[in-house]
């Protein structure tokens, strides 16, 4: 489908003139940031951003690639080098340490420098690195964590935890030796390491004693509490603050976010990760956009500002399954959350960053026709005289042989939300990829986000912009609308 107006050079010249005019007018906001928001698309490499842009555009009855995402409107962009100290291709634990704490670490370790060793409890102490969220709290700001995964998962844990093993969600996931040596599970650290004002996501089962039935799935024993220490961490957290409230469904969340007596809010909406957006029950579970809005309503009450981490965490899971439909619909919801946050905040006093922790071996190619479905077949056939899709993976469970050969694919299959795109190499799980990811920035000091940077630079930009440690002598004018 070719839009007639695009056949005329004037169309492109006019569009470029507008973009050039806007670029010439762009002025850095030189004040300090009152608020910090980091949106983390887990596994959202550039190919995912492009494919999500087309999907979102097509959901709006447009052709696709020309329709900007919310993140596309951010004026400053950089590339982030995502390698960890020990791996060319990182995981979400090492990367979270980099962009949230400002120091690169090792694969599968969280909130620790690279002097710590994976799974070795005794290498924890002395190697802790402090997150920007922790520093924001010390400066009197309200802080929050929002995710579609478990709140104890690697990315959000980078904001509050220090652990040599990202899988130590509750004490039941830890070896006895590590417990005896004094290492703490991530759920325990969530409630005890620092005072977090808003915690929204999944992960109920790690907070309650083993065998405690789940409120949503009381007859499904696999969803019961897992804690061996018999603790009720939710109760412990509630006891710390007069205005604390715990919710586990969408209705309760909406009520709590509008209640002025609620100062601290924990919402855990699934025993583990939250459901994919395409499987979500909208009566029971909030969307990422709704959780983001609820968090912003609470955090915005603090005159000293806030720090908010928002993760679209299941983009990554869709890709690991080689199910691009899941990954891309998660990415579209992630962008919707960015859009909503932009409506609820001002770029004059809020530094907003959007980035990914790492990419995936997800490719988008094969010359599909403009306007055609992102999940469709490529025009023509492959050398084996079989159809193939525009979306593919370098490795993963999408590798299948049928009678010793690559199976043909029909449009009925490729358009299904359950379809696994084909892969070149068979693996149980598709892997992360090592190429640089984008960092989009808007707001005070966003102009510092430029060029090609280490991923750890991101945390330093946030800390500097808000005059947090170690940049308390930042020498920036106070945020717009404030007096100091």
């Amino acid at each position: 489908i070719i839009p007639v107006e695009e056949e005329n050079p004037d169309f492109w010249n006019r569009q470029a003139a507008e973009a050039l005019g806007a670029a010439k007018k762009l002025q850095p906001i030189q004040t300090a940031a009152k608020n910090l928001i980091i949106f983390l698309g887990d596994g959202m490499g550039v190919s995912t951003v492009t494919a999500a842009r087309i999907l979102k555009g097509q959901k709006e009855d447009k052709l696709g690639p020309e329709t900007p995402l919310a993140m596309d409107h951010f004026p400053y962009v950089a590339l982030s080098k995502t390698y960890s100290v020990d791996k060319h291709v990182p995981d979400s634990a090492a990367t979270a340490t980099a962009y949230l704490c400002g120091v690169k670490g090792n694969f599968q370790t969280i909130g620790l420098s690279a002097a710590a060793r994976y799974n070795q409890c005794n290498t924890t102490r002395g190697n802790e690195v402090v997150s920007v969220m922790n520093r924001a709290k010390k400066a009197g700001k309200s802080v929050g964590v929002v995710t579609t995964t478990r709140v104890q998962h690697a990315s959000p844990a980078g904001a509050y935890a220090h652990t040599v093993n990202r899988n130590w969600y509750s004490d039941a996931n830890m070896p006895g030796s590590a417990r005896r040596e004094g290492c703490k599970d991530i759920a325990t650290q969530l409630i005890s390491n620092m005072d977090i004002d808003v915690i929204l996501g999944g992960g109920r089962k790690y907070m309650f004693r083993m065998g405690a039935p789940d409120p949503e799935y009381p007859h499904d024993y696999s969803q019961d509490g897992t804690r061996m220490d018999g603790k009720n961490l939710v109760q412990e957290w509630l006891a710390k603050q007069q205005g604390a409230r715990y919710v586990w469904n969408r209705t309760e969340l909406m009520q709590a976010s509008l209640d002025p007596s609620v100062t601290h809010l924990m919402g855990l909406f699934e025993p583990g990760d939250m459901k994919y957006e395409i499987h979500r029950d909208p009566t029971l579970d909030p969307s990422l956009m709704e959780m983001t809005e609820a968090a912003l309503r609470l955090l915005s009450r603090n005159p000293r500002g806030f720090f908010l981490f928002v993760e679209g965490g299941r983009i990554d899971h869709g890709h690991h399954e080689s199910r691009a439909y899941r990954a891309l619909t998660e990415a579209v919801m992630f962008d919707d959350a960015i859009e909503r946050a932009g409506q609820l905040t001002s770029e004059e006093d809020t530094l907003t960053l959007v980035t990914a922790d790492h990419s995936h071996v997800f490719s988008f190619g094969a010359y599909p026709l403009r306007g055609s479905s992102i999940f469709g077949l490529a025009p023509g056939k492959a050398q084996d005289r079989k159809a193939y899709t525009a979306l593919l993976y370098g490795n993963g469970p999408g590798y299948v042989l049928k009678d010793g050969a690559r199976p043909d694919v029909t449009e009925s299959e490729s358009g299904s939300p359950e379809y696994r795109q084909q892969a070149a190499v068979p693996l149980d799980e598709e892997t992360h990829a090592g190429e640089d990811v984008a960092v989009f920035a808007r707001g005070p000091q966003a102009h510092l986000v430029h060029g090609v940077q280490e991923q750890s630079f991101i945390a330093h930009v946030m800390a500097f912009a808000a005059c947090l440690e170690p940049y308390t002598a930042c020498d920036l004018a106070p945020p717009a609308g404030t007096t100091d």
Epitope: I1, Q58, D61, L369, G371, S372, S373, G376, S412
Partner: nanobody
Framework: QVQLVESGGGLVQAGASLTLSCAAS????????IVWFRQAPGKEREAVSC????????YYGDSVQGRFSSSTDNAKNTVSLQMNSLKPEDTAVYTC???????????????????WGEGTMVTVSS
């Protein structure tokens, strides 16, 4: 193999209702929108309606707006066109088509369709 098969046409009185059905196979509504066209004897082909699952949208031509309504049954992979308050000028061969696009962008242009059904005749007598 993509196939579109229409059914439900026939002869009705002016003011009556009729429902046409388009059974689609070889693709899902996640990858293509479905457009109904009609062609009256001696007249140009006219786009009647478009329905897109991806965009969650439906569009109608000016001449049928408010009288015709399109819906999908995703389980059966069918699209229905409910036609109410039929007029003699609605007499035509009605054909469903699958667009290149998953949404209704450019839906009224026949060249943007990739697959076509055979058509079903609707006659409205006065």
């Amino acid at each position: 193999q993509v196939q579109l098969v229409e059914s439900g046409g026939g002869l009705v009185q002016a003011g009556a209702s009729l429902t046409l059905s388009c059974a689609a196979s070889g693709f899902t509504f996640n990858t293509r929108s479905i457009v109904w066209f009609r062609q009256a004897p001696g007249k140009e082909r006219e786009a009647v309606s478009c329905i897109s699952k991806v965009a969650g949208s439906t569009y109608y031509g000016d001449s049928v707006q408010g009288r015709f309504s399109s819906s999908t049954d995703n389980a059966k992979n069918t699209v229905s066109l409910q036609m109410n308050s039929l007029k003699p000028e609605d007499t035509a061969v009605y054909t469903c088509a699958a667009s290149f696009a998953p949404n209704c962008y450019g839906w009224s242009v026949a060249a943007n369709m990739e697959y076509w059904g055979e058509g079903t005749m609707v006659t409205v007598s006065s």
